[in-house]
């Protein structure tokens, strides 16, 4: 493991032996002020105690200052996501200072050694911020540290060590190994800035969770439950990369946090919303689509400060690529069953018809099991804005699409040969839009025809008898 030394912290890696034996000495942490969107442009290097580069490179003391902090690297070079983030920040905040914290020499190590270097890098950033604070008009409140993976914990150390409180830290899938369950002073935590928001995109309960599973910010957002990201399956990466392997999947899901943040910068007109929920399963059930009492928020750059919350877990679904925004709907379906439906769970689909567009055939995901003679809640989401919902079609997929279903059908028939048919009665469906917070109730057209069996469909229209429509919109809607 390298040993930093000297005033600016320099290192010599004795284990690294290039083809020609040489001892190349590099600064361990460098601060590169990006003066252009062009990644080939060198920018300006800032150094504690040297004011000239600040003047030469037009450092704006009154503007926002972003510090982008990369994570562990196997390649030892900046990855593409960093250039995209720099460009997106420049596009969104034209007057801002964008500083890339280059700690590649300390990050281009064995992961565990890079972890052990995070503290010294955080200290280095804190020293830079302390020095900048000595300048007139520079405010720590305007500082936003954006750390990816291991860089998120570096940002935490920086926020912890600096004299004062930085305005904001965004953790983009903070690293999990060696940080999961760690003391708050040894990882990113809500105490490290005035506002700490976190995106978790690679959390796993099996294998090794590359991203941290535990909440570490004021708000912790788990897109798609924080694990399987759409567009990152082996099939997806196999299609785009020769020899797609699990590492490509890991990279895709871990890095998705960065792309969600970039999306929030460049696609202001399509802001994604997250909803507070105790866990992923409850969110998948559609229980948590409320915006009351600050229970929903924009994700990424547009997130609203919520300092009263700590470790508030929030969830959302996303598309497979930019723009990531989807439209969430909660469906409350009261199901009666006059004929026993047996052990098999019905495979139900819904199609939503709106004033702007119609949805695809959307599966009603059964998270646990359907409760009969009870109200069941489902979450569905669409990639397009449907506008006002006009009607919907419920479909029960036909019999036996799997041997398991076929066996259950047969078993049900044996246990109740006199009554083999399966039938559900559904009179109404209450729909709530997550994005607009509007509620609409839909009823079957003919109250006498409210039963559905496998292979059949049932149509619902806005209820005539004073159907409810609460028009309280979310405080985060239509921000553009």
């Amino acid at each position: 493991s390298p040993v930093p030394f000297g005033p600016e912290g320099r290192l010599e890696d004795k284990l690294h032996k290039p083809k020609a034996t040489q001892t190349e000495v590099k600064p361990s942490v460098r601060f590169n002020l990006r003066t252009s969107k062009d990644p080939e442009h060198e920018g300006c290097y800032l150094s504690v105690g040297h004011s000239q580069p600040l003047e030469d490179c037009s450092f704006n003391m009154t503007a926002k200052t972003f510090f982008i902090i990369h994570g562990w690297t196997m390649s030892g070079i900046f990855e593409n996501w960093l250039h995209k983030l720099v460009s997106a920040l420049h596009t969104r905040e034209k007057d801002a200072n964008v500083v890339v914290v280059d700690w590649l020499p300390l990050a281009h190590q064995l992961y565990t050694d890079a972890v052990n270097n995070t503290r010294v890098v955080g200290h280095s950033i804190a020293r830079m911020l302390d020095w900048l604070q000595e300048k007139d008009d520079f405010s720590l409140g305007n500082v936003h540290l954006i750390g990816y993976s291991l860089g998120a914990h570096v940002a935490g150390y920086a926020g912890n060590f600096v004299k004062g409180t930085v305005g904001r830290i965004t953790g983009l899938d903070p690293a999990g190994p060696m940080f999961e369950g760690a003391d708050i002073h040894k990882r990113l935590s809500p105490d490290d800035a005035d506002f700490v928001d976190v995106l978790h995109t690679y959390t796993r309960s099996f294998g090794l969770s590359i991203g941290i599973q535990m909440p570490v910010g004021h708000i912790d957002i788990y897109p798609n439950g924080g694990d399987f990201q759409p567009g990152c399956g082996l099939n997806d990466v196999l299609g785009s990369i020769a020899y797609g392997t699990i590492t490509e999947v890991v990279k895709c899901e871990h890095e998705r946090a960065v792309h969600l943040f970039v999306d929030s910068l460049v696609n202001q007109d399509k802001p994604s919303f997250a909803f507070q929920c105790t866990d992923s399963n409850r969110f998948k059930k559609g229980i948590c689509l409320s915006c009351r009492k600050n229970r929903c928020n924009n994700i990424g750059y547009n997130a609203k400060k919520m300092r009263k919350k700590r470790n508030s877990k929030m969830y959302l679904k996303t598309r497979a690529g930019m723009p990531f925004k989807v439209y969430h709907y909660q469906l409350k379906v009261h199901m009666f069953s006059y004929n026993n439906s047996g052990d098999t769970q019905p495979t139900l689909y819904i199609t939503l018809y709106g004033s702007n567009a119609d949805s695809q055939n959307l599966p009603l995901e059964i998270v646990e099991k359907i409760e009969l003679n009870a109200t069941n809640t489902f979450l569905v989401y669409t990639e397009e804005d449907l506008g006002d919902l006009l009607k919907m079609r419920l479909t029960w997929e036909g019999v036996a699409h799997s041997w398991y279903n076929l066996w259950n059908e047969f078993r049900n028939y044996l246990s109740q040969p006199s009554n083999p048919s399966r039938e559900l009665y559904i009179r109404r469906i209450r729909v709530k839009s997550g994005e607009t917070q509007r509620k609409v109730t839909f009823c079957t057209q003919d109250p006498t025809k409210s039963s559905i069996s496998p292979g059949q469909e049932l149509w619902f229209h806005k209820c005539q008898d004073g159907w409810k429509m609460k028009n309280k919109t979310s405080p985060f809607v239509n921000l553009a």
Epitope: S1, L15, H16, K17, P18, K19, M74, S75, G76, I77, H108, L110, Y111, T112, D113, P177, M178, L208, I210, I241, A242, Y243, T245, T247, E248, V250
Partner: antibody, heavy 119, light 107 residues
């Protein structure tokens, strides 16, 4: 599937050098580090070093830094280890193996190359 | 360098037995402990990574546990194909180091 194919057994004289090869297939060559491990007859395993083809990054165990030199040829997806100034202590089976990021484990191993140093 | 010690160099057990192999590190290795199986023909396979995670394709009768400096590999129901030498390895810091190995044989 991931495969690491190593070169055949070598019989070399003391003081000479030998170059062993490890040809990778079934994955993106430049995205994974290849490690080399030594096993003397009936003994344990010793880590020699790694080569990362993505940036030609090399790490050596201090014990082997004057003994082993790691290189690679990206076009043939092959990593090489040259052992110099051979003595009987270098007689061993040498394995190449692929590093799994974050877990710091060696998930796939070559079949090994036996090097015998004898006059 | 971190020393890895497998105190039992050889172990005899019967088919169907539950077998535990232990490994001790000279310092805390933060769960960066991996287990490998070397078959009699010399083939080496990863069994367990990061203390307790099963590598893909490895039968579930293999399990790992431990923390800090003490770790163990357990085979819950010994089968003929498990007759091999087992090595632990720390991946916490360079240079990576291995235990001396535990040779498992049939009683």
């Amino acid at each position: 599937q991931v495969q690491l194919q190593q070169s055949g057994a070598e019989l070399v004289k003391p003081g000479a050098s030998v170059r062993l090869s490890c040809k990778a297939s079934g994955y993106t060559f430049t995205k994974y580090t290849i490690h080399w491990v030594k096993q003397r007859s009936g003994q344990g395993l010793e880590w020699i070093g790694w080569f990362y083809p993505g940036s030609d990054s090399i790490k050596y165990n201090e014990k082997f830094k004057d003994k082993a030199t790691l290189t690679a040829d990206k076009s043939s997806r092959t990593v090489y280890m040259e052992l110099s100034r051979l003595t009987s202590e270098d007689s061993a089976v040498y394995f190449c193996a692929r590093h799994e990021e974050y877990t710091n484990s060696l998930a796939y191993w070559g079949q090994g190359t036996l090097v015998t140093v004898s006059a | 360098d971190i020393q890895m010690t497998q105190t039992t160099s050889s172990l005899s057990a019967s088919l169907g037995d539950r077998v535990t192999i232990s490994c001790r590190a000279s310092q805390d290795i933060s769960n960066y402990l991996n287990w490998y199986q070397q078959q009699p023909d010399g083939t080496v396979k990863l069994l367990i990574y990061y203390t307790s995670r099963l590598h893909s394709g490895v039968p579930s009768r293999f399990s790992g546990s431990g923390s800090g400096t003490d770790y163990s590999l357990t085979i819950s129901n010994l089968e003929q194909e498990d007759i091999a030498t087992y090595f632990c390895q720390q991946g916490y810091t360079l240079p990576w180091t291995f235990g001396g190995g535990t040779n498992l044989e049939i009683k």
